[in-house]
């Protein structure tokens, strides 16, 4: 695509409107103003929330933000390098309608010309909508999105980056000859060089998975990254996948087949941070199948979240979910077979007496 | 069932001394962390300490640290706080609570500690 | 101890939807659990985990989470919903638990 431009579509952009000026924000020319004149294709127009709490224009590749500390002018709040340091382009989704009355004004005359709106009775936050909804600015978040491989141990993407001078505000294959999509996980790759790919949700195993032809299930072994269970659920996520689940002996002898040769203690899907029962499968699968390690799980209000151990042959251990660790992602990709009839095996609430586990 | 039932809360001068006492059951208390949670009147909830299952290592907020202790007796299922050097600022209503996974999922109603002269 | 951020207040139109946000270095590791909270009350868990609900709680309320961000939306909100609400996690180690400073939901 040109230059900047984000090679996946943008589901988080929207437009600010105002119902007390009866207009659309605007970037321009460094500065900001309300414009009667919406228009959902003018990429002035066009804003979306980015890393750190910033909100990014895609008209001018720039952030939104005043000078340092909140001057309350409108001359202070315009359009400025998103890495420009001594200033503030932080904003908080619930208070930024409040901070653009304040700073915009709310005189209802000359409104589209920038810079020159005095300063009127404050409109309400609630006055400020997502165009065409009545959804407020915290509607459309930022979400963060975890790389694979590259050399950034699976941190997420930094938005914008600025990569051969340019600032992309998306996942880019720009500078990359095999297509693959990626982002710099620090503001400038050119000053940093860290960067990673980013996660796809396809329905094939091509890249960065492993397939076991006996059962099709696809499984991606995240070594150099280090993230918390969390975080490590929601890059499996973000592909379209879940932690690993094992649920039957097979299933431990290739995944252990493929820890051959390495030395690491890796999250799956085992957890149990949900009250309906005890341990239970990130995915829902039926745990049927058990390969904990002796005296494990243990720690039952500190240890909610399961490992496999290289140096106990593929056994299981619960961890604290906080710990930054690499994880193996799981995948069944969509079957055109007839569709298999359900499993006997299902997940039920457990009760147990006072003195047992479930 | 699980219950959690605080008791001990009252009235007390500035410098003095309490010690708070939350009865549980309906679950296996020797294999649990448990806190105190406390809300001063008007304000947020504020996490006060913990205890780890074996008693044998203890956390608490800075504000209350040389203050409040925290213990429990396993073979009661009752967790403690005692509490000496008491300020007006520790004038709260305190809970006993049992952290789930990641949570902290069960609470006492909690018991009343008016601190003043 | 990590800190978690929240509005103060928020109000809300009675059944139309508002969204509560907490913010927390501790919510990059640990998934944020919501109370509710009415006056001369105990918190109440009502959503916690990825998105889940413990038993007896509407299916009104819902959670989202990414990065250092987490979000109860309520969708339809009812009279009965107005009430302080705090999200809360564990911090690393689960050594000590981090509350946000509580939104007071006015449902109008």
């Known amino acids: 695509g040109a230059p900047g431009d984000a090679a996946l579509p943008e589901p988080n952009v929207f437009l600010i409107f105002s119902h007390g000026l009866q207009g659309c924000l605007e970037a321009q020319g460094g500065q900001v103003r309300v414009t009667p004149a919406c228009n959902t294709s003018l990429p002035a127009q066009r804003w979306k929330w980015v890393s750190r709490n910033r909100l990014f224009n895609l008209g001018t590749m720039q952030c939104l933000g005043t000078g340092w500390p909140g001057t309350n002018t409108t001359a202070s709040l315009g359009m400025y390098e998103c890495d420009r340091e001594a200033l503030n382009l932080r904003w908080h989704c619930r208070t930024l309608g409040d901070q653009l009355s304040l700073l915009l004004g709310a005189r209802t005359s000359n409104i589209s010309k920038p810079g020159t709106l005095e300063r009127g009775d404050q409109t309400r936050s609630g006055q400020w909508r997502i165009y065409g909804s009545e959804e407020d600015l915290c509607a459309l978040p930022y979400h963060e999105v975890y790389t694979i491989q590259g050399n950034s141990h699976g941190k997420p993407c930094t938005i914008p980056f600025k990569y051969d001078n340019q600032w992309f505000h998306g996942c880019t294959s720009t500078g990359r000859e095999d297509g693959h999509l990626w982002c710099a996980t620090t503001q400038d790759y050119g000053k940093d060089e860290r960067w990673g790919f980013c996660p796809i949700k396809s329905n094939d195993c091509e890249t960065f998975w492993d397939k076991d032809q006996l059962t099709d299930s696809c499984y991606q072994f995240n070594f150099q990254s280090t993230l918390s269970w969390r975080e490590a659920w929601a890059s499996c996520e973000q592909q379209g996948a879940d932690l690993l689940s094992i649920t039957e002996i097979h299933e431990q002898t290739y995944i252990n087949g493929l820890l051959t040769g390495y030395s690491s203690t890796l999250w799956i899907g085992l957890n149990d941070l949900d009250t309906s029962g005890g341990w239970q499968w990130s995915d829902n699968s039926p745990l049927k199948y058990l390969n904990w390690e002796s005296d494990q799980p243990d720690n039952p209000s500190e240890e909610n979240c399961g490992v496999i151990r290289t140096e106990s042959s593929g056994g299981w251990q619960n961890r604290d979910c906080s710990i930054a660790l690499p994880y193996v992602c799981k995948k069944k990709p969509n079957a055109t077979a007839e569709p298999t009839p359900p499993d006997r095996w299902a997940n039920v609430k457990v009760e147990c007496e006072p003195s047992w586990q479930p | 069932e699980v219950q959690l039932v605080e008791s001990g809360g009252g009235l007390v001068k500035p410098g003095g001394s309490l010690r708070l006492s939350c009865a549980a059951s309906g679950f296996t208390f020797p294999s649990y962390a448990m806190n105190w949670v406390r809300q001063a009147p008007g304000k947020g909830l504020e996490w006060v300490a913990n205890i780890k299952p074996n008693g044998n290592e203890r956390h608490s907020v800075e504000s209350v640290k040389g203050r409040f202790t925290i213990s429990r007796d396993n073979s009661k299922n009752s967790l403690y706080l005692q509490m000496n050097s008491l300020r007006a600022e520790d004038t709260a209503v305190y809970y006993c609570a049992r952290p789930g996974a990641g949570r902290l999922d069960y609470w006492g109603q909690g018991t009343l500690v008016t601190v003043s002269s | 101890s990590s800190e978690l951020t929240q509005d103060p207040a928020v109000s809300v139109a009675l059944g139309q939807t508002v969204r509560i946000t907490c913010q927390g270095d501790?919510?990059?590791?640990?998934?944020a659990s919501w109370y509710q909270q009415k006056p001369g009350q105990a918190p109440v868990l009502v959503v916690y985990?990825?998105?889940n609900r413990p038993s007896g709680i509407p299916d009104r309320f819902s959670g989202s989470s990414s990065g250092n961000t987490a979000s109860l939306t309520i969708t339809g909100a009812q009279a009965e919903d107005e009430a302080d609400y705090y999200c809360?996690?564990?911090?690393?180690?689960?050594?000590?638990?981090?509350f946000g400073g509580g939104t007071k939901v006015t449902v109008l």
């Open positions: 985990f990825k998105n």
């Open positions: 809360n996690s564990p911090n690393s180690g689960v050594i000590s638990w981090a």
């Open positions: 501790s919510l990059r590791s640990y998934f």
